[in-house]
């Protein structure tokens, strides 16, 4: 049960989180005029990935897109990339923990295989949420190196007679929104992980008879793992997760008294 | 067809108040600020300040913070400016302009401040 | 807040001559942002509200005629009719749209001689 709703838990915050990655991705106000110097300012600048744009003393906003590929700085490029990585790797990962869900019945999908999809949906939100945190970093970087940078040539004279303030940028919502998405994605990735560790099938015991050809010893071998003589269904050695989180329905590992003969 | 429809002339006492309105249509009325704008006998112009019918936010000119009050009624896609404490001053007529680059403009109304 | 300064006040033309009015402004009105000049220039003709003619320093709104052209950047901007018609006589301000208040020049008369 608790494994269930730690699963479930995890893909609906990795869910919400993608959403975010993708609206952050999507707004246009990465970074936004800095008002402190020019607070009487009608017209207002902002940007985003895709598009800058203005908005004027009558209240409309015009945007222009970036149309060219080359002439964008390289970081901007980097922190595209970066975001639209890391929504790729979220919608993958959606899709594959849709069907990883321990609620969710698909054909005879065994626990391992579910284990497993849990664990790759974990591993690519958290790769997910990582990339939007760096992309939006990167810009929010980019935006603190140009902000003092403008500051230190705050006033440009106009043939000595004139002052214009140049226009700075500071941290759009846009920002926040990203920083906020990608830690929800990679929490619900480590939720995932951690729900794949109860979902793991473990060695079932054989508690009243031990089956094996005349002849042969079964042995129990230390170190987690059981030793197998080839015949019945065992043939796999397998890890027993000791100390790890156990639901109810989950039948105990430790060896007992009837394990061997 | 864009039009900005202001009601007609006010004649008022000192330290009176008035309240006159600007009716849009033909455009989307929330995409726009609506701004006014009064204009001496004579003389140039001078912008009061502006609301936004969207969410109601305005902006004044500090010289007539006090003076002049701007409300909206979205459903009926009316602007108004109420103007308190009237002086021989305040005698002239009040224009409301709005969409991009206050390209449209009312017909003006003339308030009349006399004893 | 900005100071629009026009000049000449008053000019007397003739029918088809080409005339320049002028406009400067206290501060630069071009936005870094989209590398646009912030300033409206007006055509007031007696009884009727102000109406367009050039926005953002030169872009000429639909219906203006050709005749009209807006120049400039930064502080100082320059209204040229071509060739003036009888139409044309009113006032003509210049406005900052750049920064709040919103603030307009004094205007220039423009009469037949």
């Known amino acids: 049960m608790a494994v269930t709703a730690c699963q479930g838990l995890g893909f609906v915050v990795s869910l919400i989180g993608i959403a975010g990655i993708i609206a952050a991705t999507c707004m246009d106000q990465w970074s936004t005029q800095d008002l402190y110097n020019n607070p009487v300012t009608a017209v207002f600048n902002y940007q985003g990935l895709w598009r800058s744009c203005v908005r004027e003393s009558s209240g409309f906003t015009e945007c222009r897109g970036y149309f060219t590929l080359l002439g964008l700085p390289a970081m901007l490029q980097a922190v595209r990339a970066l975001m639209i990585v890391g929504i790729v790797l979220g919608a993958i990962g959606l899709l594959v923990s849709i069907f990883a869900l321990k609620c969710i019945r698909i054909g005879s999908m065994e626990d391992s295989a579910k284990a497993n999809m849990t664990l790759t949906s974990g591993i690519m939100f958290i790769v997910s949420g990582l990339c939007a945190i760096a992309g939006v970093s990167v810009f929010a970087n980019m935006l603190v190196t140009n902000f003092w940078m403008s500051t230190a040539n705050m006033y440009t004279g106009m043939g000595g007679m004139v002052q214009t303030v140049q226009t700075r940028y500071t941290f759009g919502a846009a920002l926040f929104v990203g920083w906020v998405a990608g830690g929800l994605t990679l929490i619900g990735g480590v939720m995932m992980c951690i729900a794949c560790r109860g979902l793991a099938p473990e060695e079932t015991n054989y508690k009243a008879v031990s089956y094996h050809a005349s002849g042969h010893s079964v042995a129990y071998k230390p170190g987690g793992f059981k030793a197998s003589t080839g015949f019945g269904s065992n043939t796999k050695n397998k890890k027993i997760y000791d100390g790890g989180a156990r639901t109810e329905d989950e039948v105990q590992s430790y060896p007992s008294k009837h394990d061997y003969v | 067809e864009i039009q900005l429809q202001q009601s007609g002339p006010e004649l008022m006492k000192p330290g009176a108040s008035v309240k006159m309105s600007c009716k849009a249509s033909?455009?989307?009325?929330?995409?726009?600020?609506i701004h006014w704008v009064k204009q001496s006998h004579g003389k140039s112009l001078e912008w009061i300040g502006y609301i936004d019918p969207f969410n109601g936010g305005t902006r004044y000119n500090q010289k007539f913070e006090g003076k002049a009050t701007l409300t909206v009624d979205k459903s009926s896609t009316t602007a108004y400016m109420h103007l308190s404490s009237l002086t021989s001053e305040d005698s002239t007529v009040y224009y409301c302009?709005?969409?991009?680059?206050?390209?449209?403009w009312g017909q003006g109304t003339l308030v009349t401040v006399s004893a | 807040d900005i100071v629009m300064t026009q000049s000449p006040s008053s000019l007397t033309v003739t029918a088809g001559e080409k005339v320049t009015m002028t406009c400067k402004s206290s501060?630069?009105?071009?936005?870094?942002?989209?590398?646009?000049?912030?300033l409206t220039w007006y055509q007031q003709k007696p009884g009727q509200p102000p109406k367009v003619l050039i926005s953002?320093?030169?872009t000429r709104q639909s219906g203006v005629p050709d005749r009209f052209t807006g120049s400039g950047s930064g502080t100082d901007f320059t209204l040229t009719i071509s060739s003036v018609q009888a139409e044309d006589l009113a006032v003509y301000y210049c406005?900052?749209?750049?920064?709040?208040?919103?603030?307009f020049g004094a205007g220039t008369k423009l009469e037949l001689k």
């Open positions: 033909g455009y989307s009325f929330t995409s726009y600020y």
């Open positions: 406005q900052n749209d750049y920064s709040y208040p919103l603030t």
């Open positions: 302009a709005s969409l991009r680059f206050l390209a449209y």
């Open positions: 953002r320093a030169s």
């Open positions: 501060q630069s009105l071009l936005n870094s942002g989209n590398q646009k000049n912030y």
